[in-house]
Interface confidence: low
């Protein structure tokens, strides 16, 4: 929304860099065949590239990524009783970011 | 994706708290009547509540917010020439978060 110019600080661009984001651990990451369980924790922190680049033809992208396995609890409900199991989910952390040209596919002639 | 349990650290819940997010400054925040301009910067950082709560009946919500006016550059293109103007956009920062019960509306009987 628009406001008074007087008290406004100059806006600073959100530069292209890694930031902490929240990643929801969906159940189908653990088991696609069965929906009768819960996952704990339901979400974790990951590092992801975000922000803006200097013109619209470039996009903030990860230039270096790292896979990080974490152990979660799979809580199966069997005959109304919880059974605790362990599972591993591999998260993707972005380590470095860069402003990369958006390659638009040329139309096939 | 699933991986080996051996090297996996226990997953830590992404707690309900403020995190830095990127907010895209859309042109209609500046001027709804005219599309023939650019905004600089195109995005800024804001503080927003995110993360998970302990059960599915509660949600991470802002308990305290602050409006923050920032000055942006509105670059109008007039006869193919850029004209630099200033405008103010008011951003919403979340200052504090809480896990709040999701009130599901009762079905009308």
């Amino acid at each position: 929304s628009l406001g008074s110019l007087a008290a406004a600080e100059p806006a600073v661009i959100a530069e292209c860099k890694t930031r902490t984001e929240v990643f929801q651990i969906s159940r189908n990451l653990i088991d696609r065949t069965n929906a009768n369980f819960l996952v704990w924790p339901p979400c974790v922190e990951v590092q992801r590239c975000s922000g803006c680049c200097n013109n619209r033809n470039v996009q903030c992208r990860a230039s270096q990524v790292q896979m990080r396995p974490v152990q979660v609890r799979k809580i199966e409900i069997v005959r109304k009783k919880p059974i605790f199991k362990k599972a591993t989910v591999t998260l993707e952390d972005h380590l470095a970011c860069k402003c990369e040209t958006i390659v638009t596919p040329r139309p096939v002639t | 994706s699933l991986g080996s349990l051996a090297a996996a650290e226990p997953a830590v819940i992404a707690e309900c708290k403020t995190r830095t997010e990127v907010f895209q400054i859309s042109r209609n925040l500046i001027d709804r009547t005219n599309a023939n301009f650019l905004v600089w910067p195109p995005c800024v950082e804001v503080q927003r509540c995110s993360g998970c709560c302990n059960n599915r009946n509660v949600q991470c919500r802002a308990s305290q917010v602050q409006m923050r006016p920032v000055q942006v550059r509105k670059i109008e293109i007039v006869r193919k020439k850029p004209i630099f103007k200033k405008a103010t956009v008011t951003l919403e920062d979340h200052l504090a978060c809480k896990c709040e019960t999701i009130v599901t509306p009762r079905p009308v009987t």
């Epitope: 100059p10 600073v12 661009i13 530069e15 292209c16 860099k17 922000g51 680049c53 200097n54 013109n55 033809n57 470039v58 970011c97 860069k98 402003c99 040209t101 | 600089w40 670059i75 193919k80 020439k81 850029p82 630099f84």
Partner: antibody, heavy 120, light 107 residues
Amino acid sequence: EVQLVESGGGLVQPGGSLRLSCAASGFTFSSYWMSWVRQAPGKGLEWVSTISDGGGTTSYADSVKGRFTISRDNSKNTLYLQMNSLRAEDTAVYSCAESGGATDYLFDYWGQGTLVTVSS
Amino acid sequence: DIQMTQSPSSLSASVGDRVTITCRASQSISSYLNWYQQKPGKAPKLLIYAASSLQSGVPSRFSGSGSGTDFTLTISSLQPEDFATYYCQQSYITPLTFGGGTKVEIK
């Protein structure tokens, strides 16, 4: 008044290293993207590298990628260029430039430059 | 990479002359073109940015035009202090590239 003063140039042998500095004053250094541009004796201008205001985004010319590193210390209002594995073709006057216009990839203000000579 | 081709590479002109320098990009750069003036032993000075916008403090005899791939710098009435080398530069995308320069000499 905007002032950019480069230092650290000199004579170095091929394969050697140098670190250039650019001391900035007269403007809010931490709010602006900064660049290095070089000019070989009697030749034209060549862009070398650019760094964002916070230092998180960097870009390099292909001719220096992997050998040169741009960095900044906003607390000291100083821009740096670490030059390794120097070659004869890197001989030039290196100038720092401030980017503060319609795009951060133009050069509003320039320093006078510092001469780097790579020779055995 | 985007190549910037300037022409002519040099020209001789007299005080009061109208001088035109052209710059061509190897692909469209919209209006992301800037012009600089450099005098011997001095740092370059920004004259025109975004193809046609006059930098603050630059005399109005300098003007720029063009978009896409073809651009022009015009000096409407050449003054003694205008004898210098002029460079175009694209700021559309990295790697940033300059034209080879146009040296304006006294006839």
